[in-house]
Amino acid sequence: AGVFELQIHSFGPGPGPGAPRSPCSARGPCRLFFRVCLKPGLSEEAAESPCALGAALSARGPVYTEQPEAPAPDLPLPNGLLQVPFRDAWPGTFSLIIETWREELGDQIGGPAWSLLARVTRRRRLAAGGPWARDIQRAGAWELRFSYRARCELLAVGTACTRLCRPRSAPSRCGPGLRPCAPLEDECEAPPVCRAGCSLEHGFCEQPGECRCLEGWTGPLCTVPASTSSCLGLRGPSSATTGCLVPGPGPCDGNPCANGGSCSETPGSFECTCPRGFYGLRCEVSGVTCADGPCFNGGLCVGGADPDSAYICHCPPGFQGSNCEKRVDRCSLQPCRNGGLCLDLGHALRCRCRAGFAGPRCEHNLDDCAGRACANGGTCVEGGGAHRCSCALGFGGRDCRERADPCAARPCAHGGRCYAHFSGLVCACAPGYMGSRCEFPVHPDGVSALPAAPPGLRPGDPQRYL
């Protein structure tokens, strides 16, 4: 027993001119998935012959939408390994078929449409338990890079997974029907392969396909307690016990149901009951339908009556992915404005706003002058958490609505006389002073304290600066 594992590293346009830009048709976005099929031996087999060693289907990859003018990328791939379990010995030589399928997500009637994009076939020799084998294959204009290996499971060892290994914690004596292997005392070598299903505890065999029972047990697979200590049809004593020959094989002998399917006999035949995720009369192919519950996190499954009808998961808010398996990082969209801190609480988003800002997305500026116009030509100045008006001369108050006497504050120095004017105020300076507020004295020797007198003015002239 063991598992064949396939890891797809990349799938994309091959090198050279004429390589396709996109796997999708003009009808819109698509996503990729892969099917692996294993057939025994190295012979050329018809493409549609059964995958006798098993088959597996990957999950759907992320949705791909072609970006115009962008360089053709390696395409987004499904996560994880493709695994094909095998029950019997690993054959060593096999045919590996990898199909790349496209699922178009445009507005097809009846749901997404499938088409085969590329198919590679490799005939290979491979020992179980070895390292990953890497390969690059071309299929038309496409290039596929992948690795694969076969590994043993369930205490099986060896290049064909036919030797049984006793765990170190087990008793030092090998179990019934197992001989110690030399030179490793921690391993036990399998005898001839008994009939499939033959009880490990109560049966053994000396010839392939046999199932002989230990004393006290009977039945074709030695699973039935015997009412007497002897059996009919004795073949003779064995080294360990008295054995019974089994009757002719029944329809379920050898367990024709793959992938853990359970077999039940019907008149002259058998039927398999497949575990979740497997389909076909013999459970030989993996697949997913709505009945398999493929949508996580409360996603709603639509379509998918059988694996030939693609299912679609409609995800609840906060989740995405073909199976609603990914939590949306809603904060990555930076919904909080004006430097607000985003908090994804699962059921909702919260924005923690900086001082001076408010609103669900911090969109309101508390200093915002909008809607708070300053009257009478005043200008609004933001800052300090509240708006402020800089009023035109002659006006005052919070919103510049109050009339103000510009001369009330006595702005003209040195006894200058103040006159209110439509655009402000005018100071008429007393003799010996100049400036808009009569702030500069004029010296008797005719030299102003200013660095230079404004052109066209003589010292001593009355100053009328507006």
Epitope: W114, L281, R282
Partner: nanobody, 127 residues
Framework: QVRLVESGGGSVQVGGSLRLSCAAS?????????MGWFRQAPGKEREGVAA????????SYADSVKGRFTISQDNAKNTVYLQMNSLKPEDTAMYYC???????????????????WGQGTQVTVSS
């Protein structure tokens, strides 16, 4: 969604033969489908005629057609055929092709077990 397109129907005399074809769209499950032929005569229920498993080794027939009809497939063309010999007037009906990827069990002649259906092709047997 699997697309099924039937062809080959027509009018024939009693005792004659017809061969119906059902072309199916390809999918990863092309070789793991139950493909069935069903028929519906005017005013009657739809009934199963024959079925096969595209993975091989399993066919079944309605008692009324055993020995006269044969279901077969061409995997390379993704097509299933119904060869109808020794036709009788009671074989007159609209013939439908249907498909499903089963979950174990067997390929039965029960229309409730099939999810994908073609549009049908008319067969008329006249005396």
């Amino acid at each position: 969604q699997v697309r099924l397109v039937e062809s080959g129907g027509g009018s024939v005399q009693v005792g004659g033969s017809l061969r119906l074809s059902c072309a199916a769209s390809r999918s990863p499950y092309s070789s793991s489908r139950c493909m069935g032929w069903f028929r519906q005569a005017p005013g009657k229920e739809r009934e199963g005629v024959a079925a096969l498993y595209t993975g091989g080794g399993s066919t079944s027939y309605a008692d009324s057609v055993k020995g006269r009809f044969t279901i077969s497939q061409d995997n390379a063309k993704n097509t299933v055929y119904l060869q109808m010999n020794s036709l009788k007037p009671e074989d007159t009906a609209m013939y439908y092709c249907a498909a499903v990827v089963p979950r174990g069990g067997s390929c039965r002649l029960d229309e409730r077990g099939y999810y994908h259906w073609g549009q049908g092709t008319q067969v008329t047997v006249s005396s």
